[in-house]
Interface confidence: low
């Protein structure tokens, strides 16, 4: 009798351990990717940034995948997405092609199943970086809460990539899962 | 027999209550600290801001510690960190030392065990605050997801502290734990 | 005996299912509201934005209510609130009333029980949008962690509403519950 009860208890504990494991906070996917400055495109046009670190310094990833410059969702859910993009220029780098700049970031979602790309968030500013000042700097921050499905991909597009600040504390993006889809 | 079963059930319930308590959402650490304007350093140099409120107005803290101007982590985990910093100047406050300003924020992490300080996030802008306009304002927002260990300290450094907006809705920083470390 | 044990186990499972349901991640309230550009006020004064989408494109809501231009809290808790506001102007839209602009956002909380309104977060910048450039753009992002009670209302005020960017990826605000109140 007592043995039987213990078996029943083990079943209870076992099923609950499974549920606990699934819902435990540390099962939640996340990523924080920092710019890989060795491979930043040049020019002033809008480009997709494909080189990011995922495993050094502040960069890290769990239960998500980084591939071909895109952050791939492995687990359906609602995620908080964010990006911080810094641009800078010093007169020692040479003259700017134009003093009137459009410094922008676009956080995009691509669905592979239905090949399509959509902008989730954008931010930035037009700037007049005059030659009267030897140093210029500007940062953009965007963030928002989005439903993401397994297989969907998040990528970052910027204008004027040659002006990006290559520090890991300056140019990064990330995501963390907040809750399941009902 | 029935008594024994109830004892077993109590054990099951008890162990699960412990697990529930540990993983319950309200156990998660957080802080939202607002600027204490009575003690803002003067000058235009980069300084660490040490005076923040943690228990009035919007400011609050739980399962973290605020001491000596730093937000101290008490519980290992992955945290979302954020800061909002507003700068302003009115001509009635007197002339600016220079019209060319670098308005910046740096969110830093200090590890006591291995005495070292690192910048987790930075943001800001160079600004030309000309005398043609009597009022100037600029805000910076940064946010990111970081692994923090118990004992580590988060602090805020800014340039031009004398230009900080002293309102609690303007200049603040915070953190909340999102998940455990695997 | 065995039947009795199963009844006890069912009771254990039942009570835990209730607890699990309550604490499950997908029970957490959230909202991501995007600007409804068909009803943006004109002018340069500070106004409360009352027209937002909650059920199309990226906009979504769960366990919160959107009514009369305000996001209403249905469940006590600590929430992360955020807003992204983009302003833009093209010379084809006609001249600006003034080249010196104050582009601001205020995230406010209204308590109905004790009728009062308070600003939780603000951000923005003074801008000089000169006629020398045909296009101007500027984005603001703010975010913070706040205790919200059932019945409280979150709303967005901006200056210069006629300059708002009407895209869903540009002008939005949202909230998600992070944890219960102790």
């Amino acid at each position: 009798g007592s043995q039987h009860i213990r078996a029943e208890k083990a079943m209870v504990d076992g099923s609950w351990l499974d549920l606990a494991k699934r819902s435990k906070l540390e099962a939640q996917p996340f990523a924080h990717l920092t710019i890989n400055a060795t491979d930043i495109p040049s020019g002033s046009h809008k480009v997709s940034l494909s080189s990011w670190y995922h495993d050094r310094g502040w960069a890290k990833i769990s239960n998500m995948t980084f591939s071909n410059g895109k952050l791939i969702v492995n687990q359906d859910g609602f995620y908080y997405l964010y990006a911080n993009i810094c641009f800078r220029h010093h007169e020692t780098s040479g003259d700017l092609a134009t003093e009137y700049l459009q410094l922008m970031v676009y956080v995009t979602k691509t669905s592979i199943k239905i090949p399509s790309s959509h902008t989730l968030m954008k931010g930035g500013s037009t700037k007049y970086w005059s030659g009267n000042s030897e140093f210029h700097f500007y940062s953009i921050n965007v963030g928002g809460f989005f439903k993401l499905r397994s297989g969907e991909e998040i990528s970052i597009e910027v204008s004027n990539p040659s002006l990006l600040d290559p520090d890991q504390d300056a140019t990064y993006f990330g995501a963390f899962k907040v809750r399941d889809i009902d | 027999g029935s008594q024994h079963i109830r004892a077993e059930k109590a054990m099951v319930d008890g162990s699960w209550l412990d697990l529930a308590k540990r993983s319950k959402l309200e156990a998660q650490p957080f802080a939202h600290l607002t600027i204490n304007a009575t003690d803002i350093p003067s000058g235009s140099h980069k300084v660490s801001l040490s005076s923040w409120y943690h228990d009035r107005g919007w400011a609050k803290i739980s399962n973290m510690t605020f001491s000596n101007g730093k937000l101290i982590v008490n519980q290992d985990g992955f945290y979302y960190l954020y800061a909002n910093i507003c700068f302003r100047h009115h001509e009635t406050s007197g002339d600016l030392a220079t019209e060319y300003l670098q308005l910046m924020v740096y969110v830093t992490k200090t590890s006591i065990k291995i005495p070292s300080s690192h910048t987790l996030m930075k943001g800001g802008s160079t600004k030309y605050w000309s005398g043609n306009s009597e009022f100037h304002f600029y805000s910076i927002n940064v946010g990111g997801f970081f692994k923090l260990r118990s004992g580590e300290e988060i602090s805020i450094e800014v340039s031009n502290p004398s230009l900080l907006d002293p309102d609690q809705d303007a200049t603040y920083f915070g953190a909340f734990k999102v998940r455990d470390i695997d | 005996g065995s039947q009795h044990i199963r009844a006890e186990k069912a009771m254990v499972d039942g009570s835990w299912l209730d607890l699990a349901k309550r604490s499950k991640l997908e029970a957490q309230p959230f909202a991501h509201l995007t600007i409804n550009a068909t009803d943006i006020p004109s002018g340069s004064h500070k106004v409360s934005l009352s027209s937002w989408y909650h059920d199309r494109g990226w906009a979504k809501i769960s366990n919160m209510t959107f009514s009369n231009g305000k996001l209403i809290v249905n469940q006590d808790g600590f929430y992360y609130l955020y807003a992204n506001i983009c302003f833009r102007h093209h010379e084809t839209s006609g001249d600006l009333a003034t080249e010196y602009l104050q582009l601001m956002v205020y995230v406010t909380k209204t308590s109905i029980k004790i009728p009062s309104s308070h600003t939780l977060m603000k951000g923005g910048s003074t801008k000089y949008w000169s006629g020398n450039s045909e296009f101007h753009f500027y984005s603001i992002n703010v975010g913070g962690f706040f205790k919200l009670r059932s019945g409280e209302e979150i709303s967005i005020e901006v200056s210069n509403p006629s300059l708002l960017d009407p895209d869903q990826d540009a002008t939005y605000f949202g909230a998600f519950k992070v944890r219960d109140i102790d």
């Epitope: - | 009575t38 009115h90 009022f135 309102d167 | 004064h45 205020y106 200056s159």
Partner: antibody, heavy 114, light 108 residues
């Protein structure tokens, strides 16, 4: 709530201290302003004191008034050398900035006369 | 400093009254409006240029930013007879008075 006290008839040149007592909120987190109103006239902002204890004054009030915190629930306004022009109702109010002066006391009357 | 106009205005019950306040410099949205009746302290009506204070009827409306501000009272009632003041809450540096000179509203 806010309540002023200490108003009375004084002769010119005799220092006078008015006290503002607050309850229901904290002086450690709120700015307190002093405002006066001469009979039949408008409101004159004298100055305020930060939650941290630092006072600020209108140009005309500098040197004529001193604002200080005397305890955790009281703020004082000292009229250093009253003249007949200082005859007025003196109000203490919470706030100053974008939220306005949102809690006022009933006022206390100061009469300066020979 | 704050310049308030008009100094006095007469209005019929149900009418509308507009009071203007001009700041000598840009004060953003840091402006409040007050109502004062004889023998009473001022009462906060509007703060942040346009936000209605607790318990204030919606017939009171504040607008403006920078240097130009307006208080509008629509559907005036007898109880609205009072003196109204504006107050800047931005700068305490080098100012003579944070308040406007006041506007007396007489209801007929």
């Amino acid at each position: 709530s806010v309540e002023e006290s200490g108003g009375r008839l004084v002769t010119p040149g005799t220092p006078l201290t008015l006290t503002c007592t607050v309850s229901g909120f904290s002086l450690s987190s709120d700015v307190m302003s002093w405002v006066r109103q001469a009979p039949g006239k408008g409101l004159d902002w004298i100055g305020y004191i930060w939650s941290g204890g630092r006072p600020y004054y209108a140009n005309w009030a500098k040197g004529r008034f001193t604002i200080s915190k005397s305890s955790s629930t009281t703020v004082d306004l000292k009229i250093t050398s009253p003249t007949t022009e200082d005859t007025a109702a003196y109000f203490c109010a919470r706030g100053f900035g974008s939220s306005g002066l949102n809690i006022w006391g009933p006022g206390t009357l100061v009469t300066v006369s020979l | 400093d704050m310049t308030q106009t008009p100094a006095s205005v007469e209005v019929a019950v149900g009418g509308t009254v507009t009071i203007k306040c001009q700041a000598s410099q840009n004060i953003g949205y840091n402006l409040a409006w007050y109502q004062q009746k004889p023998g009473q302290p001022p009462k906060l009506l509007i703060y942040g240029a346009s936000t209605l204070a607790s318990g204030v009827p919606s017939r009171f409306k504040g607008s403006g930013s920078g240097t130009q501000f307006t208080l509008t009272i629509s559907g005036v009632q007898c109880d609205d007879a009072a003196t109204y003041y504006c107050q800047q809450g931005y700068s305490v540096s080098n100012i003579d008075n944070a308040f406007g000179g006041g506007t007396e509203v007489v209801v007929k």
